[in-house]
Interface confidence: low
């Protein structure tokens, strides 16, 4: 039976915040989240004709139906899931750092390893187009993750959000069970943008509803006059739409979807830059650990040779061509580029009535062989998850005690 769950600290928290400061750091309620950023940067006639659905997901091609398995990034023999990436040379140093920190967070918490592109068939290309958007799951070939400079101004949260899409995850607030936990205020939504709130029909949600998921949109998403479009039902004051880090549930979902465990053989360090890269990636690839070290070394001493302390050559930008190559196809996101994007995940349909384009993406279940239901005598005996509320997971899984404004601490 649904009831709100507030994350709490067992033991001492490794991170604390001054009173009144949310874990989003500088992100106040007035700061722009993904929908607002994209509305400001991408000029479209109508949501129906847009190449984006739900505000930041590249509309999947109706011509490419992939199986659930092929939509996941493949796991290597060592239990590590490698996602090759190219990082555009157009990013300045601070922007690159923000992106790399987000990639590193996945390495710290999950079995996902973002490795530099080395002619792999399937890879993501992270480029500063107009807006923050990506596709859901692995599409095959090159797939675009757009992170405009505005998407990076408030830290790594939006990067994490888009990378969760890349790994195969949809938005929290469009879950099939969302009506138990949030109220969608349809009258407050920008006319024509209601499509962004259509529920998923998938029942494969892996963990209970999580208000603190990095995949949850904020209260004002697609608001027409600054009033909430999303209202949490369980706790009026709970914060939604955090863009700070992966919540505990976000991490659990990644581990469940990919059927893996988080830690590699090396012990995890402390702090935002100390992290384990786990088992080594493919020999040809340069690990994020070394990239971060190299970047740090680069910023400390401008070595003209471009070599890191260990003598390894560092490319002009992590995962990019030394010449800053960028595919001409990326100059504009055309219908063809859109058609390259992944069909969603396969088996239970994610219906999108009124989505405009014929044969709009049918989501497919990520869960191929993973059951989210216990063995029970009746199929009706499904378990109803309780939503998680409160803060996202901070280092060590802790939550600042003062984050629950006006709420009692559990």
């Amino acid at each position: 039976l649904g009831a709100p769950l507030a994350s709490s600290c067992a033991g001492a928290c490794g991170t604390s915040f001054p009173d009144g400061l949310t874990p989003e750091g500088t992100q106040a309620s007035g700061d722009k989240d993904i929908p607002a950023i994209n509305q400001g940067l991408i000029l479209e006639e109508t949501p129906e004709s847009s190449f984006l659905i739900e505000g930041d997901i590249i509309r999947p091609s109706p011509f490419r139906l992939l199986s659930a398995t092929s939509n996941k990034w493949p796991m290597g023999g060592s239990g590590v899931v490698e996602v090759p990436f190219l990082l555009s040379s157009k990013y300045d140093e601070p922007s690159r750092q923000v992106i790399l920190e987000a990639l590193a967070e996945f390495e710290r918490s999950t079995c996902i390893r973002f490795v530099t592109y080395q002619d792999q068939r399937d890879f993501i290309s992270i480029i500063p187009m107009y807006g923050c958007f990506s596709s859901v799951g692995r599409s095959g070939g090159m797939q675009v993750v757009s992170l405009a400079p505005t998407c990076l101004q408030k830290g790594r949260g939006i990067v994490l959000h888009e990378l969760m899409h890349v790994l195969g995850f949809w938005h929290e607030h469009t879950r099939a069970d969302r009506d138990r936990y949030i109220r969608v205020n349809w009258n407050e939504i920008l006319p024509g943008f209601e499509i962004n709130f259509i529920k998923s029909q998938s029942s494969n949600m892996l963990t209970p509803y999580d208000y603190s998921s990095v995949m949850h949109y904020g209260r004002l998403a697609f608001s027409r006059r600054g009033l909430p479009t999303i209202t949490p039902l369980w706790a009026p004051s709970v914060h939604i739409g955090q863009r700070w880090n992966l919540s505990a549930s976000d991490i659990t979902r990644v581990l469940k979807l990919y059927g893996c465990s988080p830690s590699g053989p090396r012990p995890r360090g402390r702090g935002s830059h100390a992290h384990s890269t786990g088992r080594s990636p493919a020999p040809a690839s340069l690990s994020l650990q070394r990239l971060l070290e190299a970047l740090s070394a680069e910023s400390r001493s401008p070595d003209p040779s471009g070599s890191s302390a260990g003598g390894q050559p560092v490319p002009a930008g992590p995962g990019e061509s030394p010449h800053g190559w960028e595919s001409p196809a990326l100059k504009k996101l055309s219908a063809e580029a859109s058609a390259r994007q992944p069909q969603t995940l396969a088996s239970s349909p994610r219906s999108r009535p009124g989505a405009g384009a014929p044969g709009v993406a049918q989501e497919q279940s990520w869960l191929a062989g993973v059951s989210t239901k216990p063995t029970v005598p009746s199929s009706e005996a499904g378990i109803q998850p309780v939503p998680v509320q409160g803060s996202p997971a901070l280092p060590g899984g802790c939550v600042p005690r003062n984050h629950f404004k006006g709420m009692s601490e559990d």
């Epitope: 039976l1 769950l5 505990a248 059951s371 998680v388």
Partner: antibody, heavy 116, light 112 residues
Framework: EVQLQQSGPELVKPGSSVKISCKPS????????MVWMKQSHGKSLEWIGA????????TYNQKFKGKATLTVDKSSSTAYMELRSLTSEDSAVYYC?????????WGQGTLVTVSA | DVLMTQIPLSLPVSLGDQASISCRSS???????????LEWYLQKPGQSPKLLIY???NRFSGVPDRFSGSGSGTDFTLKISRVEAEDLGVYYC?????????FGSGTKLEIK
């Protein structure tokens, strides 16, 4: 088959604490939240609260805040409830149940008796 | 908190008779998602409660069709068309729409 095995009866002194356990089987422990209920002798049932096994997040019935603390141990797939500052009012049978849209499965109950 | 009031507290019946138990909530338990999370449980002496009916009128797996639930808003009823010996025990209604979730005080079904 879904089953919930609760720890045995407890006889405790007033003012002390007790920690009772609930170990489910037949489904993945971290997939669903665990709910706890209290039933005093000859009386009705009361909902104490729920815990999310993934991250330890909890929600409580206001009446039991400060009295009950819910925890989980993911490594052993076990849920726990600690009751503190016990009085005779806390003498009851305590049940755990996975958090379904309805309580399809219950533990057998743990009898806690508070007596000097 | 939502108060769940059951009537009667005790219901003496003869085997084969029809039995009817009423449950009234202090406020509507229609959830904002359109569902009414009203359940009925039977508890026999020395046992844990067993689910009979969920969401007002849905029989749980394995529950005989002589049990039926009805109602809406604040008034709900459990009917047993022909009482059998195994039906004896205490019946509880329960609302799961508003936190904290609450049970009724119980109705004891006993042989007349």
């Amino acid at each position: 088959e879904v089953q919930l095995q609760q720890s045995g009866p407890e006889l405790v002194k007033p003012g002390s604490s007790v920690k009772i356990s609930c170990k489910p089987s037949g489904y993945t422990f971290t997939d669903y939240n665990m709910v706890w209920m209290k039933q005093s002798h000859g009386k009705s049932l009361e909902w104490i609260g729920a815990i999310n096994p993934n991250n330890g997040g909890t929600t409580y019935n206001q009446k039991f805040k400060g009295k009950a603390t819910l925890t989980v141990d993911k490594s052993s797939s076990t849920a726990y409830m600690e009751l503190r500052s016990l009085t005779s009012e806390d003498s009851a049978v305590y049940y755990c149940a996975p958090n379904w849209d309805w309580f399809a499965y219950w533990g057998q109950g743990t009898l806690v008796t508070v007596s000097a | 908190d939502v108060l769940m009031t059951q009537i009667p507290l005790s219901l003496p019946v003869s085997l084969g008779d029809q039995a009817s138990i009423s449950c009234r909530s202090s406020q509507s338990i229609l959830h904002s998602n359109g569902n009414t999370y009203l359940e009925w449980y039977l508890q026999k002496p020395g046992q844990s409660p067993k689910l009979l009916i969920y969401k007002v009128s849905n029989r749980f797996s394995g529950v005989p069709d002589r049990f039926s639930g009805s109602g809406s808003g604040t008034d709900f009823t459990l009917k047993i068309s022909r009482v059998e010996a195994e039906d004896l025990g205490v019946y509880y209604c329960f609302q799961g729409s508003h936190v904290p979730f609450t049970f009724g005080s119980g109705t004891k079904l006993e042989i007349k």
